[in-house]
């Protein structure tokens, strides 16, 4: 039985050209996290494997940094980065937990700076 829950940063906004941390946290389970995948709707951004470490997809290598922790830092943001991001926790023995974050990248300085995991 899957008892865990994923807490995410929820809906966040950031300025074009800036950086943002995508962060998820799995709680309420003793399951072992074997891998965390970070994905957009149609492509893989990165994988953090418990044995093998981080793999950043080639198309994101120049502007995605691993961490902090199991999170992911997106740099040099563009308006095209607006959209849904998913953290997918592969665990044993529970199975898969998925969290969703919506990022809006804004043209000007109207971006909110109050998001809990956001880089100022």
């Amino acid at each position: 039985m899957m008892t865990g829950t994923i807490e995410t940063t929820g809906n966040i906004s950031a300025e074009k050209g800036g950086s943002i941390i995508l962060q998820c946290h799995l709680s309420s389970t003793t399951a072992q996290v074997t891998q965390v995948n970070w994905e957009q709707q149609d492509q893989l951004l990165a994988i953090c494997n418990a044995d093998l470490g981080w793999h950043i997809s080639p198309s994101f290598k120049d502007r995605v940094a691993p961490g902090p922790g199991l999170g992911l830092t997106l740099q040099s943001l563009t308006v095209n980065d607006t959209g849904e991001y998913f953290c997918i926790y592969h665990t044993y023995p529970d199975g898969t937990y998925t969290g969703r974050i919506f990022l809006e990248v804004l043209e000007s300085s109207v971006a909110e700076h109050g998001a809990r995991f956001q880089i100022p």
């Epitope: 044995d51 981080w54 793999h55 950043i56 080639p58």
Partner: antibody, heavy 121, light 107 residues
Framework: DVQLQESGPGLVKPSQTLSLTCTVS?????????WSWIRQPPGKGLEWIGY???????NYNPSLKSRVTISRDTSKNQFSLKLSSVTAADTAVYYC??????????????WGQGTSVTVSS | DIQMTQSPSSLSASVGDRVTITCRSS??????LAWYQQKPGKSPKLLIY???SRYSGVPDRFSGSGSGTDFTFTISSLQPEDFATYYC?????????FGGGTKLEIK
């Protein structure tokens, strides 16, 4: 250039343990790579057996997990495969391969030439 | 485990032809998909990883595309040395699994 070379007996009796070694040359064995075993039965496709990481963590295919052990000897630049209780279904060409996970994920970039193992009495 | 299905299982073509092989996964694998070339009696060679990234030294006539569960591998203009068997592999989650292979033969 990185080179991998499998070695071990070409014939193993049913119920015995298959033991293979992969020797890595042209490469620092202690750096951030993982090392994998893959097999290919005659005329068939490829099956991933498992890996050992740079930190000595192992991960095995669940279909073989109860029979497989992968270990390494950094002083000899070698890693090995042991597969117990073999049957004719374990007859295959066995390959060792390198995992450069940071760059290529779980795609394997360097392979040995393979060694053929037949299980027969 | 994630099952990988390749089609066709065999294919006849001529030098200069454009050839396309498809690979379908039984579950979502995002863009974590690799393609290998294997010639008889030889070990597989990595051609494509992360669905569309060419491995170092691989000619640009080889390309890959797709995401999710449906993937395509294309050789834009077949050369004599390209006749071989091609395998897809998902590297999304262990156990990493391979397709059954596509044997590319001379017509």
């Amino acid at each position: 250039d990185v080179q991998l070379q499998e070695s071990g007996p070409g014939l193993v009796k049913p119920s015995q343990t298959l033991s293979l070694t992969c020797t890595v040359s042209g490469h620092s064995f202690t750096s951030d790579y993982a090392w994998s075993w893959i097999r290919q039965p005659p005329g068939k496709g490829l099956e991933w057996i498992g890996y050992i990481s740079y930190s000595d963590s192992t991960n095995y295919n669940p279909s073989l997990k109860s029979r497989v052990t992968i270990s390494r000897d950094t002083s000899k630049n070698q890693f090995s495969l042991k597969l117990s209780s073999v049957t004719a279904a374990d007859t295959a060409v066995y390959y060792c391969a390198r995992l450069d996970y940071g760059n290529y994920g779980g795609a394997m970039d360097y392979w040995g030439q393979g060694t053929s193992v037949t299980v027969s009495s | 485990d994630i099952q990988m299905t390749q089609s066709p299982s065999s294919l006849s073509a001529s030098v200069g032809d454009r050839v396309t092989i498809t690979c379908r996964s039984s579950q979502h694998v995002s863009t974590a998909l690799a393609w290998y070339q294997q010639k008889p009696g030889k070990s597989p060679k990595l051609l494509i990883y992360s669905a569309s990234s060419r491995y170092s030294g691989v000619p640009d006539r080889f390309s890959g595309s797709g995401s999710g569960t449906d993937f395509t591998f294309t050789i834009s203009s077949l050369q004599p040395e390209d006749f071989a068997t091609y395998y897809c592999q998902q590297h999304y989650i262990t156990p990493w699994t391979f397709g059954g292979g596509t044997k590319l033969e001379i017509k």
